[in-house]
């Protein structure tokens, strides 16, 4: 088992928007999850966006998942991973 | 460490107001996290109330909707619980705890309080 | 709203044995799950998280388990200290709502 890096990047939007994305990379094996987390719980999921799982080319799994907030708000959301029976979450930077 | 508080009146009368605060040390509830209210009745059942949040952002059980308003007083970083027109049925121990964004879980609650609603 | 649904209500065990505790969620609550203790007159304390993962200071004879609509705690050699009443919350969706219990008394 090969544990995922996560990264969490933010970048404009809309006015008063901002989309933040979580990106898993080089994990293995390929079954994950990630989600947002917006105060606490589950985001619904027609207000996420999901890449696919792809290979990276080193034997090892990618995928991301990417959300509009608002701008002000970042506190309240949290990015969830799971794989392998391990747990993370992860801030949207400031 | 955080630590909650609760305090108010043990004895309300129905069709009163129920008003109960959280004093909260150790943390301030404006830099982060959900500030609940959480109650248990005397059969034991637990029910969520609802929180107010870091920046003063409300969220209530619809079951409570009508009759819940959770306010606060930065200056004091305490919250409060108003329920209006109380019945028998709200006789409850009332605790306030919070949960951090990574999960709506309870890390801590307070001591809770015993609030009886009798003529 | 998600109800959920705890069994047994109660039990009654020994010193040293194992006990399991289920819950049961009325939709797929996809681990968003946390367990209580609460022992008589005093507050519930956090056990579990995320369906699985053990809060700070919870002994290692607790674990949990579980997926989709179904989860369990189990506990390895009961100790004094175990007996009291345990309780399941789902956080996938507000309303957040708690299991009515399982009372573990002294056989």
């Known amino acids: 088992t090969v544990p995922p890096m996560v990264n969490v990047t933010r970048s404009e939007a809309s006015e008063g928007n901002i989309t933040v994305t979580c990106r898993a990379s080089s994990f293995y094996p390929r079954n994950i999850i990630l989600t947002w987390r917006q105060d606490g719980v589950s985001l619904s999921h027609d207000t996420q966006q999901w890449g696919d799982v792809l290979p990276d080319g080193n034997g090892t799994y990618q995928t991301w998942v990417a959300t509009r907030i608002c701008a002000g708000e970042e506190q309240r959301f949290t990015c969830y991973m799971e794989h392998s029976g391990n747990h993370s979450t992860h801030p949207v930077p400031s | 460490d955080v630590q909650l508080q609760e305090s108010g009146p043990g004895l309300v009368k129905p069709s009163q107001s129920l008003s109960l605060t959280c004093t909260v040390t150790g943390y301030s509830i404006t830099s982060d996290y959900a500030w609940n209210w959480i109650r248990q009745f005397p059969r034991n059942k637990l029910e969520w109330m609802g929180y107010i949040n870091y920046s003063g952002t409300t969220n209530y059980n619809p079951s409570l909707k009508s009759r819940i308003s959770i306010t606060r007083d930065t200056s004091k970083n305490q919250f409060f619980l108003q329920l209006i027109s109380v019945t028998t049925e709200d006789t409850a121990t009332y605790y306030c705890?919070?949960?951090?964004?990574?999960?709506?879980?309870?890390?801590?609650w307070g001591q809770g309080t015993l609030v009886t609603v009798s003529a | 709203d998600i109800q959920m649904t705890q069994s047994p209500a109660s039990l009654s065990a020994s010193v040293g044995e194992t006990v399991t505790i289920t819950c049961r969620a009325s939709?797929?609550?996809?681990?968003?799950l946390a367990w209580y203790q609460q022992k008589q007159g005093k507050s519930p304390q956090l056990l579990v998280y995320?369906?699985?993962m053990l809060a700070d200071g919870v002994p290692s004879r607790f674990s949990a388990s579980g997926s989709g609509t179904q989860y369990s705690l189990k506990i390895n050699s009961l100790q004094p200290e175990d007996f009291g009443s345990y309780y399941c919350?789902?956080?996938?969706?507000?309303?957040?709502?708690f299991g009515a219990g399982t009372k573990v008394e002294i056989k």
């Open positions: 995320n369906a699985i």
């Open positions: 919350q789902h956080f996938w969706s507000f309303p957040l709502t």
């Open positions: 939709g797929n609550i996809h681990n968003y």
């Open positions: 705890s919070y949960y951090r964004y990574d999960g709506a879980w309870f890390p801590y």
